[in-house]
């Protein structure tokens, strides 16, 4: 004979756990239904009555099957240095990421809490390590024989052009100037660019207040615990 399918609420067999999308209610001592994503518990189960769920209100959400009495509040609107990559819905939180030319200096569980502009290497310095979504540009002084004459978060140090006759020797921030109109060897015209990270598609010209050689600052924050009851026993 096939086993009877138990309908919630039901008392679990000793030593067994509740089924998928159910939770064990310690007060009722029963397996009760969870609420689906986008909902929350409006009335908890009793020994003979199952959980009653209700939709999350505007600007609140639940992402997992849950039995929380209140939906979670969506994060605040994205700031001017961010773009909203995921909208707040009843089933998901708003996600803000840094706009091009910025990186995430302080992350949160999803998205970014605090964006900062990518460092720009001033003339005489080039990009040693490009910026990413979560790390700043690292600048380095141009080595002898190389230069950078731009203030940029993407330009690397380029070799000086090699002249038959040097009019003005190159330095870290200026290319060599040749007397003859055709140097024996030169770089292709235009600045050499590093590949840009996803979040750095446009350039900004404001100089950084700190020295260009300042090391990139990392922020490490512990992740907070997941919300209670929400999905604490999985789907």
């Amino acid at each position: 004979l096939p086993a009877q399918v138990a309908f919630t609420p039901y008392a679990p067999e000793p030593g067994s756990t509740c089924r998928l999308r159910e939770y064990y209610d310690q007060t009722a001592q029963m397996c009760c239904s969870k609420c689906s994503p986008g909902q929350h518990a409006k009335v908890f189960c009793t020994k003979t009555s199952d959980t009653v769920c209700d939709s999350c209100e505007d600007s609140t959400y639940t992402q997992l099957w849950n039995w929380v009495p209140e939906c979670l509040s969506c994060g605040s609107r994205c700031s001017s240095d961010q773009v909203e990559t995921q909208a707040c819905t009843r089933e998901q939180n708003r996600i803000c990421t840094c706009r091009p030319g910025w990186y995430c200096a302080l992350s949160k569980q999803e998205g970014c809490r605090l964006c900062a502009p990518l460092r720009k290497c001033r003339p005489g310095f080039g990009v040693a390590r490009p910026g990413t979504e979560t790390s700043d540009v690292v600048c380095k002084p141009c080595a002898p024989g190389t230069f950078s004459n731009t203030t940029s978060s993407t330009d690397i140090c380029r070799p000086h052009q090699i002249c038959n006759v040097v009019a003005i020797p190159g330095n870290a921030s200026m290319d060599a100037v040749c007397t003859s109109t055709s140097p024996t060897r030169s770089m292709a015209p235009g600045a050499v660019h590093l590949p840009q990270p996803v979040s750095t598609r446009s350039q900004h010209t404001q100089p950084t207040p700190e020295p260009s050689t300042a090391p990139s600052t990392s922020f490490l924050l512990p992740m907070g615990p997941s919300p209670p009851a929400e999905g604490s026993t999985g789907d």
Partner: antibody, heavy 119, light 106 residues
Framework: QVTLKESGPGILQPSQTLSLTCSFS??????????VGWIRQPSGKGLEWLTH???????YYNPALKSRLTISRDTSENLVFLKIANVDTADTATYYC???????????WGQGTTLTVSS | DIQMTQSPSSLSASLGGKVTITCKTS??????IAWYQHKPGKGPRLLIH???TLQPGIPSRFSGSGSGRDYSFSISDLEPEDIATYYC????????FGGGTKLEIK
């Protein structure tokens, strides 16, 4: 406006049975998700949850007192009753009834009725 | 049964000041904690539920926080009418109150 009011004998002798009544208005025990419970406070001590009854007649009891407690209701008259058998001086307390809503919080309380158990 | 340890049992503070009361539970209660204000001759009054949600009509001077087994309740900008005994209540596994905190004003 939700109100609850407790009534009881005031004084009992040890071994007698305590009968308390909670009369309420502003809500109905026929309303899905609502219940009425009893909490007591011995003089100079903290609050102690005793029992409550839900709209669907499900009952919950404090395990330490379960054998002595009986809760019942009259939905048509908006009454909830509590009986405590075999009272002792330790049962001397102020007894409160309170409404409990579907998320299990006691949100409205009566002013309490005092019981003294003395021989 | 879940045990509730509320502290301090009494405290005295100045008008306009701030006080904090804590409740520790014997097991994780998933934020299912409420806070009540109790004045003599009256029934307790629900101030906060689900750790930090203020009941309608309760001033924002009252606040709650916590998770797991550790919870706290604060009153800022103390006023004379705040003189009362305050209780925590866990409702994750049946119901159990803390021992109470009697608040006095200096």
């Amino acid at each position: 406006q939700v109100t609850l009011k407790e009534s009881g004998p005031g004084i009992l002798q040890p071994s007698q049975t305590l009968s308390l009544t909670c009369s309420f208005s502003g809500f109905s025990l026929n309303t899905f998700g609502l219940g009425v419970g009893w909490i007591r406070q011995p003089s100079g001590k903290g609050l102690e949850w005793l029992t409550h009854i839900w709209w669907n007649d499900d009952k919950y009891y404090n395990p330490a007192l379960k054998s002595r407690l009986t809760i019942s209701r009259d939905t048509s008259e908006n009454l909830v009753f509590l009986k405590i058998a075999n009272v002792d001086t330790a049962d001397t307390a102020t007894y409160y009834c309170a409404r409990i809503e579907g998320l299990r919080r006691f949100d409205y309380w009566g002013q309490g009725t005092t019981l003294t158990v003395s021989s | 049964d879940i045990q509730m340890t509320q502290s301090p049992s009494s405290l005295s503070a100045s008008l306009g000041g701030k006080v904090t009361i804590t409740c520790k539970t014997s097991q994780d209660i998933n934020k299912f904690i409420a806070w009540y204000q109790h004045k003599p001759g009256k029934g307790p009054r629900l101030l906060i539920h689900y750790t930090s949600t203020l009941q309608p009509g309760i001033p924002s001077r009252f606040s709650g926080s916590g998770s797991g087994r550790d919870y706290s309740f604060s009153i800022s900008d103390l006023e004379p009418e705040d003189i009362a005994t305050y209780y925590c209540l866990q409702y994750a596994n049946l119901w159990a109150f803390g021992g109470g905190t009697k608040l006095e004003i200096k």
